[in-house]
């Protein structure tokens, strides 16, 4: 079998994973997209998914995971904030296209989270501490039935962060070194 390619990210606890999954094809723009973890010997498990149909430049938060789908650019932005050692593992982005099998987006992400905070910001984060407020309203994620249902928090209408992020207006509490969201949204 062909070995799927992986991109490795080594980060410290408390930092943020901030990656892009390219799908390029316009036909996938409105398709629902998901972030999955792949554990040895198990089926991929969906951790978060976009709405169906997926909205342009509209952040969706599931716990510490934030997904933003940029239709104009054919890419899904995935952020996992306040990383923990136990977040280490293999991840992938997929596009749901029922009744067909999900379409996997390359490359898979091999995340390695280690203990101890590094004072020097990594390549995917900065040293500014953003203080966010999690919006009170939640809705059920409309992820396919064969995955675990998750609670999705929609982005609030306006960020109360001390440093405003370009597209996402999701705010989290007690999170350090959050990469500020791309303004392209």
């Amino acid at each position: 079998a062909t070995k799927l390619t992986e991109e490795k990210y080594e980060l410290k606890e408390g930092q943020t994973l901030d990656v892009k999954c390219d799908y390029t094809l316009e036909k996938f723009a409105s398709s629902q997209k998901a972030w999955q973890i792949i554990r040895d010997g198990e089926m991929p498990k969906t951790l978060a998914c976009t709405e169906r149909p997926s909205k342009n430049s509209h952040p969706v938060q599931v716990g510490r995971i934030i997904l933003e789908d940029y239709h104009d650019h054919g890419l899904l932005r995935v952020r996992m904030v306040n990383l923990q050692v136990e977040d280490s593992g293999l991840y992938q982005c997929v596009i749901y296209q029922p009744p067909k099998e999900p379409h996997m987006l390359f490359d898979r992400i091999r995340l390695v989270v280690t203990k101890g905070f590094s004072g020097t910001p990594g390549s995917n984060e900065n040293s500014t501490q953003n203080v966010y407020k999690i919006p009170p309203t939640t809705t059920k994620a409309l992820c396919p039935l064969y995955t675990s249902p998750r609670t999705v928090t929609q982005a609030p209408p306006k960020s109360t962060a001390d440093v405003s992020t370009p597209d996402s207006e999701i705010n989290l509490t007690n999170v350090t070194d959050i990469i500020r969201v791309p303004v392209f949204n």
Epitope: S57, P121, F184
Partner: antibody
């Protein structure tokens, strides 16, 4: 045709006001964040501000240099973006572009020149 | 604010040359960087988004690389229509900021 067309530029005295418009066509305007970017004569590009899309409640962001003086608004029913500029200063003299984001402006207007001078 | 420092500010080159422009962010911006080309009297044109994604319709001689704080735009073989000013822009956080520009001139 997918395009953006700005209008409303002109000569205005310091302290005066001006309203720029940007007419969009060929795409679903309400789905997109829209920005204003300006360029002073012979200078580089400067981001002015953004109005987010309908899904993000049309919230706005501004550069510090224009905050409190400039207001960005939009009318999705008219596929139009606006920039209301008050208390204009000579340093606001520039070509103003409207642009569609967000991860890079793939669509720009042709620009409209605003000259602030006494 | 995130400062974007572009270098060089100008470069003289000949048709067929390989040209490299660099852009450095004052703090990490992940992959959220765009490159534009602008010709006199015209609006900028998007070349690269998300650091390395080539915008549709842009010739493959243009390429982008980098992440975090250091980014590069490369023109593999300069063509006559490539003489212009190039700008980088960070899209990671507000306020959005541009580099000062690099003018590519004919040697």
């Amino acid at each position: 045709e997918v395009q953006l067309v700005e209008s409303g530029g002109g000569l205005v005295q310091p302290g005066g006001s001006l309203r720029l418009s940007c007419a969009a066509s060929g795409f679903t305007f309400s789905d997109h964040h829209m920005d204003w970017v300006r360029q002073a004569p012979g200078k580089g590009l400067e981001w002015v501000g953004r109005t987010r899309n309908k899904a993000n409640s049309y919230t706005t962001e501004y550069a510090a240099s224009v905050k409190g003086r400039f207001t960005i608004s939009r009318d999705d029913s008219k596929n139009s973006l606006y920039l209301q500029m008050n208390s204009l200063k000579t340093e606001d003299t520039a070509v103003y572009y409207c642009a569609r984001g967000p991860l890079g402006y793939k669509l720009w207007g042709q620009g409209t020149l605003v000259t602030v001078s006494s | 604010d995130i400062q974007m420092t572009q270098s060089p500010s100008s470069v003289s080159a000949s048709v067929g040359d390989r040209v490299t422009i660099t852009c450095r962010a004052s703090q990490g911006i992940s992959s959220w960087l765009a490159w534009y080309q602008q010709k006199p009297g015209k609006a900028p044109k998007l070349l690269i988004y998300a650091a390395s994604n080539l915008q549709s319709g842009v010739p493959s001689r243009f390429s982008g690389s980098g992440s975090g704080t250091d980014f590069t735009l490369t023109i593999s073989s300069l063509q006559p229509e490539d003489f212009a000013t190039y700008y980088c822009q960070q899209a990671n956080s507000f306020p959005l900021t541009f580099g000062g520009g690099t003018k590519v001139e004919i040697k």
